[in-house]
């Protein structure tokens, strides 16, 4: 996470340091596009993989085991087989070029129309290339050629099912349908706090307004991601830290524009598993009333 050395609130009467908000949003978009994008665009497949990894690609079955005898095994959302992929229509409406912020790709036609923020759902999406998906500020990650190719992604047959335990009043088992195997984790550089500048030769990418540096690292295979592979894991930011890292005051109510600046960081934090502690599978080792999910708010 970029850290600021500046005092934030005194300089902006609105309670937001817009320069910092834009730069931080771009940083998180860059992280996400590095993991799931290719050539500065997010394909439908990459978008699906992102949704899959943050756990919202399909309905999942949750078993809740309560401590009390009279509440045994409740099943919620048993229709976990039903995929929601059919909801994602060609991605035009997901990343049209109107909203706001951050980082944007433009297609090779030279139309430099890139969207900028997180919720992309409003104007002027006709005729847009569905790859115009980086929000305001999402910019070319430096290891563009090192991005995982959709073709290299982990196939369903290679994926196993994993159970995450969250122990609190009751034990909640979230049964995920597709999760990474130990052998399919990303290298340690996936989510480093501030990616180093790459000084290798620049080339013009097929997206009109971006230059992409040749990668100095091996291409990563597969979209599956776990922050446990990271020697420098991303911190789990609570509400206050998310706000201050974007140059926003913690006492001031957020409007929609300001909330939009936070969206990439929120998604990135979920995707990087920043707020999950992976505990032993042996229940006996889990002390009562402990949490494998850090309290983030």
């Amino acid at each position: 996470f970029p850290q600021t050395t500046e005092k934030i609130s005194p300089n902006w009467e609105s309670g937001i340091n817009v320069d910092l908000a834009i730069s931080t949003r771009q940083y998180h978009l860059q992280q996400l596009f590095y993991r799931y994008g290719e050539n500065n665009s997010l394909s439908v497949e990459g978008f699906r993989k992102l949704l899959q990894n943050i756990g919202i690609d399909k309905i999942k079955r949750i078993h809740i085991h309560h401590d009390h005898d009279h509440h045994s095994d409740h099943e919620h959302h048993s229709d976990h087989e039903r995929h929601s992929d059919h909801e994602h229509h060609s991605e035009h409406e997901h990343h049209s070029d109107h909203d706001h912020h951050s980082h944007h790709n433009h297609a090779a036609s030279g139309k430099n129309k890139r969207k900028a923020l997180c919720p992309d759902h409003d104007s002027d999406s006709s005729g847009k290339d569905p790859r115009n998906s980086q929000g305001k500020g999402a910019h070319r990650p430096e290891h563009a050629s090192g991005r995982r190719n959709v073709k290299d992604s982990v196939s369903a047959s290679e994926v196993t099912s994993t159970v995450y335990n969250t122990v609190s009043e009751g034990t909640h088992f979230l049964e995920t349908i597709e999760t990474p195997r130990p052998g399919k984790l990303f290298p340690k550089d996936v989510s480093s706090s501030t990616p180093p500048s790459v000084t290798s030769k620049s080339r013009v990418s097929r997206l009109a307004g971006r230059k992409t540096n040749e990668s100095v690292s091996e291409p990563r295979k597969g979209f599956m991601y776990s922050r446990n592979t990271n020697e420098n894991p991303q911190e789990c930011f609570n509400a206050s830290k998310l706000l201050t890292s974007h140059g926003m005051g913690i006492q001031v109510p957020l409007n929609a524009t300001e909330f939009n600046y936070l969206c990439p960081a929120i998604i990135n934090q979920i995707d990087a598993r920043s707020c999950l502690i992976h505990t032993s599978e042996k229940k006996a080792e889990i002390p009562p009333k402990t949490y494998s999910l850090q309290i983030a708010w």
């Epitope: 500046e6 990616p195 230059k211």
Partner: antibody, heavy 113, light 107 residues
């Protein structure tokens, strides 16, 4: 105190390159992106490009073939290079920290033989 | 690219008056607009960001409004030091683009 100070030549020969260094203080290049803008009487203010915290860059498509922005975080310096300048590239070139009041003092560049 | 149009190149006003400078975007830019003031021989100085939020140190006689495609910078109780050129800029989509400027002249 946030400051951006520019240094570079004022006169460039046609077809030659322009190099400007922007040295920042009061903030870190690992926290903020730095943008480049130019201003000319004929074309007004034009956004040229940006280098972000991780070293990634975005360029105005109109300049991508001849523009390069890089930086040295440890020295708090951002480097701007534009190739193949012509007379219509005569302008004041600014570095700036995003859409804020923090701009460099500007470098007046005249392209002339 | 998004075109930011400031239809009035020059505006004439008197000290104490109220004046409004307008800017129109060629497509929706939400509230991602900055207003700059530039005095001769100086770098632009940002007055307003996010269409309506004043930067600190900017007198409260400067107010910004608008969203989507239509934006206004209003200067109430104009002072002689407000003689300058005013630019709008959108930072919603790349490339960021500027309006052509409106020069404020004091009668």
């Amino acid at each position: 105190q946030v400051q951006l100070k520019q240094s570079g030549p004022g006169l460039v020969q046609p077809s030659q390159s322009l190099s400007i260094t922007c040295t920042v203080s009061g903030f870190s290049l690992t926290t903020y992106g730095v943008h480049w803008v130019r201003q000319s009487p004929g074309k007004g203010l034009e956004w040229l490009g940006v280098i972000w915290t991780g070293g990634t860059t975005d360029y105005n498509a109109a300049f991508i073939s001849r523009l390069s922005i890089s930086k040295d975080n440890s020295k708090s310096q951002v480097f701007f290079k534009m190739n193949s300048l012509q007379a219509n590239d005569t302008a004041i070139y600014y570095c700036a920290r995003g859409p804020s009041s923090y701009w460099g003092q500007g470098t007046l560049v005249t392209v002339s033989a | 690219d998004i075109v930011m149009t400031q239809s009035q190149k020059f505006m004439s006003t008197s000290v104490g008056d109220r004046v409004s400078v307008t800017c129109k975007a060629s497509q929706n830019v939400d509230t991602n607009v900055v207003w700059y003031q530039q005095k001769p021989g100086q770098s632009p100085k940002a007055l307003i960001h996010s269409a309506s939020y004043r930067y600190s140190g900017v007198p409260d006689r400067f107010t910004g409004s608008g969203s989507g495609t239509d934006f206004t910078l209003t200067i109430s109780n104009v002072q002689s030091e407000d003689l300058a050129e005013y630019f709008c800029q959108q930072y919603n989509n790349y490339p960021w683009t500027f309006g052509g400027g409106t020069k404020l002249e004091i009668k």
